[in-house]
């Protein structure tokens, strides 16, 4: 699902307040709900009818430093006999997510949000078939 | 996939620099890659063998204000005949993502990252069957 553009008003103070200096805001350290955890079933990537692999990208100037991308293993889906059925499609499920980018120039450190496209897993889809004339 | 805890060093300046005031950092406004877009196929949520619906949550003090959650429509998966096959499982695919929380006390506005658990879609899984003695 896509993230809309950040509204100009999001970073502004209430109208009755003196304006904020242009370009930067105060970011509190620490993360709300930092201990919240994914409770996804074990090994769904290998037991799915549209299985996938994971690739990890690493960047020490990004939080989270580790971003995991899924790649569907097959074009088709795995049937009850464990064979690939090419009449069906393994299709990636994508999500726009935010990461925090650390930028330093000398001793000046600042942070900026960055939008990243993550493929989270795959799903099996029945395509509608058309014959081109 | 889960986001690890933010390391204490992530918000620190290089060792040779004077230390940062505890508790807050400079956040640049604007978003890197803001125009990047999900290229997910239309209607995969209804064409999937593990179809899902979407629910939208809205919070004006969060960026993005709109967070979309998927819910699997069925316990089982849809077979080639369009019937639910309860020997298979529709399973949610979850992703930890970051949002930006806006906090104001009077005219003081600050921001903090918040971890949110998003169900992005569903996949069809072959369950491991155990018979309990």
């Amino acid at each position: 699902r896509k993230i809309p553009k950040v509204g100009h008003t999001f970073f502004q103070k209430p109208e009755s307040c003196p304006p904020v200096p242009e370009g930067s805001m105060k970011l509190d350290t620490g993360i709300i709900n930092e201990n919240q955890r994914v409770s996804m079933s074990r090994n769904i990537e290998s037991r799915s009818t549209s299985p996938w692999n994971y690739t990890v990208t690493w960047d020490p100037n990004r939080y989270p430093s580790e971003v995991v991308q899924a790649q569907c293993k097959h074009l088709g889906c795995i049937n009850a006999q464990g064979k690939e059925d090419i009449s069906m499609n393994s299709v990636p499920i994508q999500q726009e997510t935010l990461v925090l980018r650390r930028k330093h120039q000398g001793c000046s450190v600042s942070f900026q949000l960055e939008k990243v496209l993550v493929t989270v897993g795959c799903t099996c889809v029945t395509p509608v078939v058309h014959h081109v004339q | 996939r889960k986001i690890p805890k933010v390391g204490h060093t992530f918000f620190q300046k290089p060792e040779s620099c004077p230390p940062v005031p505890e508790g807050s950092m400079k956040l640049d406004t604007g978003i890197i890659n803001e125009n990047q877009r999900v290229s997910m196929s239309r209607n995969i949520e209804s064409r999937s063998t593990s179809p899902w619906n979407y629910t939208v949550t809205w919070d004006p003090n969060r960026y993005p204000s709109e967070v979309v959650q998927a819910q699997c429509k069925h316990l089982g998966c849809i077979n080639a005949q369009g019937k639910e096959d309860i020997s298979m499982n529709s399973v949610p695919i979850q992703q930890e993502t970051l949002v930006l929380r806006r906090k104001h006390q009077g005219c003081s506005v600050s921001f903090q990252l918040e971890k949110v658990l998003v169900t992005v879609g569903c996949t069809c899984v072959t369950p491991v069957v155990h018979h309990v003695q």
Partner: nanobody
């Protein structure tokens, strides 16, 4: 609407080579994969080869592995099938497939005949 233009079929001797191409146009955005199926006289249609658009991942039928190579040109929305060491049993109508994940388009086919 979507158009598929297939070309490159023809008559070739056993052991020879052919290169099929299929160009997609029209509303062919967000391609999932493109590939080829074939149908020999009196037989069922079978998968030959496919290539995923996002990362060029390829799949082949066991019967053509090592002899056929599928490739793509993203900028032209075109897929190619290089067929080497052709055998009489490769004789068939070869159909191009354009897959957009939830919709799949089939071309009209191009005839490949392998005969001496």
């Amino acid at each position: 609407d979507v158009q598929l233009v297939e070309s490159g079929g023809g008559l070739v001797q056993p052991g020879g080579s052919l290169r099929l191409s299929c160009a997609a146009s029209g509303r062919a955005s967000s391609i999932n994969w493109m590939g080829w199926f074939r149908q020999a006289p009196g037989k069922e249609r079978e998968f030959v080869a496919g290539i995923r658009w996002s990362d060029a991942y390829t799949e082949y039928a066991d019967s053509v592995k090592g002899r056929f190579t599928i490739s793509r040109d993203n900028s032209k929305n075109t897929v190619y099938l290089q067929m080497n060491s052709l055998r009489p049993e490769d004789t068939a109508v070869y159909y191009c497939v354009l897959d957009l994940s939830t919709v799949r388009y089939w071309g009209q086919g191009t005839l490949v005949t392998v005969s001496s």
